[in-house]
C-alpha cells in the first residue's frame, strides 16, 4: 500500500484510518496514493505546516475527536484535491487567517463541536465551492456581516448551538443557494426584518430553542420554498397575521414550547402540504372560527397543554383530512355539539384533563369513525343517551376520574357501559363519586336499585394500538435522550408522549391504544 | 444520501431476546418516524409499529404489543427494535423504514436483519 | 383490522408490455382528499422499496412507466411497459389505521 505507518490501517481503496491515544503526531510516511485519511481520537493536540504535503490525490481528510487546539496556517497546504475536511470536535479556539487557502476543490467544511469565539469573512473568502458548512456546538456569539459573502455556492449552513445573541440582516444576503439554515439553540432573542429575504432556495429553517419573542411580518415572505420550519421552544407570544402567509411548500411547522396566547383566523396558510401541527404548551386560550380552514391536508393536530377555555363552533373548519386531534390538558368546560361536526375523517381525539361537565348529545354526530376518545380526569357526572351509539369502530373509550354521580339516570350509560366493557380497557375503570354510599364503586357493576339485565359482552374487534404514546418508558432514559435534552416534570401522572430537545412531551398526545398510521 | 443501516444477523435460542438496530444517516433523524417491519421466510410483509424520535413516542401493532420494544438514542442517530421471549415464528426478517409524516408511506428501508430461533 | 387482497398472485408478462396489479381493501382507505394506500417493489435478497404514494404519486426517482390509482377499496398499480428489471413482488399497503400489507404479486417475464 506504499508504505502504510504501524498505528495506522491502509486499504486497497486507498483508505488510512489512524485512530488511538496513542497518536500525538500526524503519522508518516502516509501513502502517496491516500485519498481519504482519517485521525480519531487520538492525542494530537497541533497540526504543524504541511504535515500532508506528500498526499496530495486527498479527496476527504477527516480530523475528529481528538485533542486538536493549535493549527498552523499551512497545514493543508498542497491539499487542492481535498472536496471534505472534517476538523468536528476538537478543542480548536481560534482558526488561523488562511488555513483554507489554496483548497479549491473543497465543497463540505465541518469544523463544528469545537470552542471556536469567532469567525472573520477573510477566514472563508478563498472557499467558493463550499456548500456546506456545520459551525454548530461552538462558543461564537456573533457572525460579523461578510463572513459568507464568498460562499455564493453554499448549500448548507449549521450555526446551532451557539451563543448568538443577534443576527446582521446582511449576514446571509449572499447565500441564494442556501437550502439548509439552522440557527437552533442559540441566544437570539429577535430576528431583524429582512434577514431571510435572500435566501430563495431555503427548504429548512431551525429556530427552535431560542429566545426570540417577535417575528416580522414578512420575515419568511421571499422564502417560497421553505418545507420545514422550526419555531419551536422560543418566547413568542403573537405571530403577526401574515407571517406563514407565502410559505406554499410548508410540510413542517413547529410552535410548541412558545407563548402564543390566540391564533387568528387564517393564520396557518394556505400550506397544501402541512401535514401534522404541534402546537402543545403554549398559552392558548380560545380558538376563533377557521383558524386552522387553510389547512386542508392537515392529518394530526396537537392542542395540549395550553390553556383553551373556549372553542368556537367553527374553530376547526377545513380539517376534513384530520386523523388524530389532542386538546386534553386544557381548560375546557363546555364544548358546542358542532365543534367536532367537519372532522368527518377522525379517529382519535383527546380530551381528558380538562374541566368538562357535560357533553352535547351530538358532540360526536359526524364523526362515524372515531377509534378512541380520551375523555378521563373531567368533572362529568353523567353523559348523554346513546352519545356513542353510532361510534361503530370505537374501540378504547377512557372515562375514568370523573366524579360520575350513580343515580337512577346513570342507568343508561352504566348499561352501555357494560354492553362494552372491552372498549373501557383494563387499567383503570370509571368509579362513582356520588351519593356517598357508593362512592368509589365501579360505575360499571354498581347496583342502582334498579334489575338490570344480565348481558352478553360483545367481543370487540382488536383495534389498533396506540395514537400517541403509553407504550414509552417513564423519563429520564439517557439511553434515548440526547445529552442536551432538558426536560420539564410531566403535566399530569398519566404520561403518554415523551420528546427529545428541550420538553417532556410524554403527555402531549394523551391518546392510547387505537390507531397507529 | 440517506441511510438506514441495519446490524447483522442474529442467530438466538427460543425464550432468549435480541435487540436489532437501525443506524441512520444522511437526515435529520429526529425529524422522521421509523417504523420497523417483519418478513417471516417466504411470507409478505407485517408491520410492527413505528417510533417518533422527535418525541420518543411508540405505536404498536397489537399483535406484536408485549413481543417488540421500540427505542432510539438520537445522540447516535439510531433506533432500536428488542424482540422477547422469542419462538420459532419469530424467525425472519426484519426491516426498519423511515416515514416522512405518521401517516406517509416508508421511502426509505434498511437492508434488513435476519434473526434465526433455534434449538 | 383491514385486509388487502392483491391480485393476481403472481403475473406473467412479455417484455413491452403493460402489467396490472389490483388491491382491494376490506373497507375504504380514502377521504376526498387521499387515498392511504402505498405501493412498493421488493427483488429477492433486497428490502422493499416504495415506487407509489397515496394512491398515485410517483416516489422521486421512480421511472414514469409506473402509475398507480384508484380510491376507496379498489387499487391498480400499472407498470406500461415490462423491464427486465421489473421483476420482483410487488406489495400494496394501507396507513389508514393499523398498517397492513397486501399478500404480493410475483411479476415474472413470459
Known amino acids: 500500500y506504499h508504505g502504510c505507518p504501524s498505528e495506522c490501517t491502509c486499504s486497497r481503496a486507498s483508505q488510512v484510518e489512524c485512530t488511538g491515544a496513542r497518536i500525538v503526531a500526524v503519522p508518516t510516511p502516509l501513502p502517496w496514493n491516500a485519498m481519504s485519511l482519517q485521525i480519531l481520537n487520538t492525542h494530537i493536540t497541533e497540526l504543524n505546516e504541511s504535515p500532508f504535503l506528500n498526499i496530495s490525490a486527498l479527496i476527504a481528510l477527516r480530523i475528529e475527536k481528538n485533542e486538536l487546539s493549535r493549527i498552523t496556517p499551512g497545514a493543508f497546504r498542497n491539499l487542492g484535491s481535498l472536496r471534505y475536511l472534517s476538523l468536528a470536535n476538537n478543542k480548536l479556539q481560534v482558526l488561523p487567517i488562511g488555513l483554507f487557502q489554496g483548497l479549491d476543490s473543497l465543497e463540505s467544511l465541518l469544523l463544528s463541536s469545537n470552542q471556536l469565539l469567532q469567525i472573520q469573512p477573510a477566514h472563508f473568502s478563498q472557499c467558493s465551492n463550499l456548500k456546506e458548512l456545520q459551525l454548530h456546538g461552538n462558543h461564537l456569539e456573533y457572525i460579523p456581516d461578510g463572513a459568507f459573502d464568498h460562499l455564493v455556492g453554499l448549500t448548507k449552513l449549521n450555526l446551532g448551538k451557539n451563543s448568538l445573541t443577534h443576527i446582521s440582516p446582511r449576514v446571509f444576503q449572499h447565500l441564494g443557494n442556501l437550502q439548509v439554515l439552522r440557527l437552533y439553540e442559540n441566544r437570539l432573542t429577535d430576528i431583524p426584518m429582512g434577514t431571510f429575504d435572500g435566501l430563495v432556495n431555503l427548504q429548512e429553517l431551525a429556530l427552535q430553542q431560542n429566545q426570540i419573542g417577535l417575528l416580522s411580518p414578512g420575515l419568511f415572505h421571499n422564502n417560497h420554498n421553505l418545507q420545514r420550519l422550526y419555531l419551536s421552544n422560543n418566547h413568542i407570544s403573537q405571530l403577526p397575521p401574515s407571517v406563514f402567509m407565502q410559505l406554499p411548500q410548508l410540510n413542517r411547522l413547529t410552535l410548541f414550547g412558545n407563548s402564543l396566547k390566540e391564533l387568528s383566523p387564517g393564520i396557518f396558510g394556505p400550506m397544501p402540504n402541512l401535514r401534522e401541527l404541534w402546537l402543545y404548551d403554549n398559552h392558548i386560550s380560545s380558538l376563533p372560527d377557521n383558524v386552522f380552514s387553510n389547512l386542508r391536508q392537515l392529518q394530526v393536530l396537537i392542542l395540549s397543554r395550553n390553556q383553551i377555555s373556549f372553542i368556537s363552533p367553527g374553530a376547526f373548519n377545513g380539517l376534513t383530512e384530520l386523523r388524530e386531534l389532542s386538546l386534553h390538558t386544557n381548560a375546557l368546560q363546555d364544548l358546542d355539539g358542532n365543534v367536532f361536526r367537519m372532522l368527518a375523517n377522525l379517529q382519535n381525539i383527546s380530551l381528558q384533563n380538562n374541566r368538562l361537565r357535560q357533553l352535547p348529545g351530538n358532540i360526536f354526530a359526524n364523526v362515524n369513525g372515531l377509534m378512541a376518545i380520551q375523555l378521563q380526569n373531567n368533572q362529568l357526572e353523567n353523559l348523554p343517551l346513546g352519545i356513542f351509539d353510532h361510534l361503530g369502530k370505537l374501540c378504547e373509550l377512557r372515562l375514568y376520574d370523573n366524579p360520575w354521580r350513580c343515580d337512577s339516570d346513570i342507568l343508561p350509560l352504566r348499561n352501555w357501559l357494560l354492553l362494552n366493557q372491552p372498549r373501557l380497557g383494563t387499567d383503570t375503570v370509571p368509579v362513582c363519586f356520588s351519593p356517598a354510599n357508593v362512592r368509589g364503586q365501579s360505575l360499571i357493576i354498581i347496583n342502582v336499585n334498579v334489575a338490570v339485565p344480565s348481558v352478553h359482552v360483545p367481543e370487540v374487534p382488536s383495534y389498533p394500538e396506540t395514537p400517541w404514546y403509553p407504550d414509552t418508558p417513564s423519563y429520564p432514559d439517557t439511553t434515548s435522550v440526547s445529552s442536551t435534552t432538558e426536560l420539564t416534570s410531566p403535566v399530569e401522572d398519566y404520561t403518554d408522549l415523551t420528546t427529545i430537545q428541550v420538553t417532556d412531551d410524554r403527555s402531549v398526545w394523551g391518546m392510547t391504544q387505537a390507531q397507529s398510521g | 444520501e440517506v441511510q438506514l443501516v441495519q446490524s447483522g444477523a442474529e442467530v438466538k435460542k427460543p425464550g432468549s431476546s435480541v435487540k436489532v438496530s437501525c443506524k441512520a444517516s444522511?437526515?435529520?433523524?429526529?425529524?422522521?418516524?421509523i417504523h420497523w417491519v417483519k418478513q417471516a421466510p417466504g411470507q409478505g410483509l407485517e408491520w410492527i409499529g413505528l417510533?417518533?424520535?422527535?418525541?420518543?413516542?411508540?405505536n404498536y401493532n397489537q399483535k406484536f404489543k408485549g413481543k417488540a420494544t421500540l427505542t432510539v438514542d438520537t445522540s447516535t442517530t439510531t433506533a432500536y427494535m428488542e424482540m422477547s421471549s422469542l419462538r420459532s415464528e419469530d424467525t425472519a426478517v426484519y426491516y426498519c423504514?423511515?416515514?416522512?409524516?405518521?401517516?406517509?408511506?416508508?421511502?426509505?428501508w434498511g437492508q434488513g436483519t435476519t434473526v434465526t430461533v433455534s434449538s | 383490522d383491514i385486509v388487502l387482497t392483491q391480485s393476481p398472485d403472481s403475473l406473467a408478462v412479455s417484455l413491452g408490455e403493460r402489467a396490472t396489479i389490483n388491491c382491494r381493501a376490506s373497507?375504504?382507505?380514502?377521504?376526498?382528499?387521499?387515498?392511504?394506500m402505498h405501493w412498493y417493489q421488493q427483488k429477492p435478497g433486497q428490502p422493499p422499496k416504495l415506487l407509489i404514494k397515496?394512491?398515485?404519486s410517483l416516489e422521486s426517482g421512480v421511472p414514469d412507466r409506473f402509475s398507480g390509482s384508484g380510491s376507496g377499496t379498489d387499487f391498480t398499480l400499472t407498470i406500461s411497459s415490462l423491464q427486465a428489471e421489473d421483476v420482483a413482488v410487488y406489495y400494496c399497503?394501507?396507513?389508514?389505521?393499523?398498517?397492513?400489507f397486501g399478500g404480493g404479486t410475483k411479476v415474472e417475464i413470459k
Open positions: 397515496y394512491a398515485s
Open positions: 423504514a423511515r416515514g416522512d409524516n405518521k401517516y406517509d408511506a416508508m421511502d426509505y
Open positions: 373497507q375504504s382507505v380514502s377521504t376526498s382528499s387521499y387515498s392511504y
Open positions: 417510533v417518533y424520535p422527535y418525541i420518543g413516542g411508540t
Open positions: 399497503e394501507h396507513s389508514w389505521e393499523i398498517r397492513t
Open positions: 444522511g437526515f435529520t433523524f429526529t425529524d422522521y418516524y
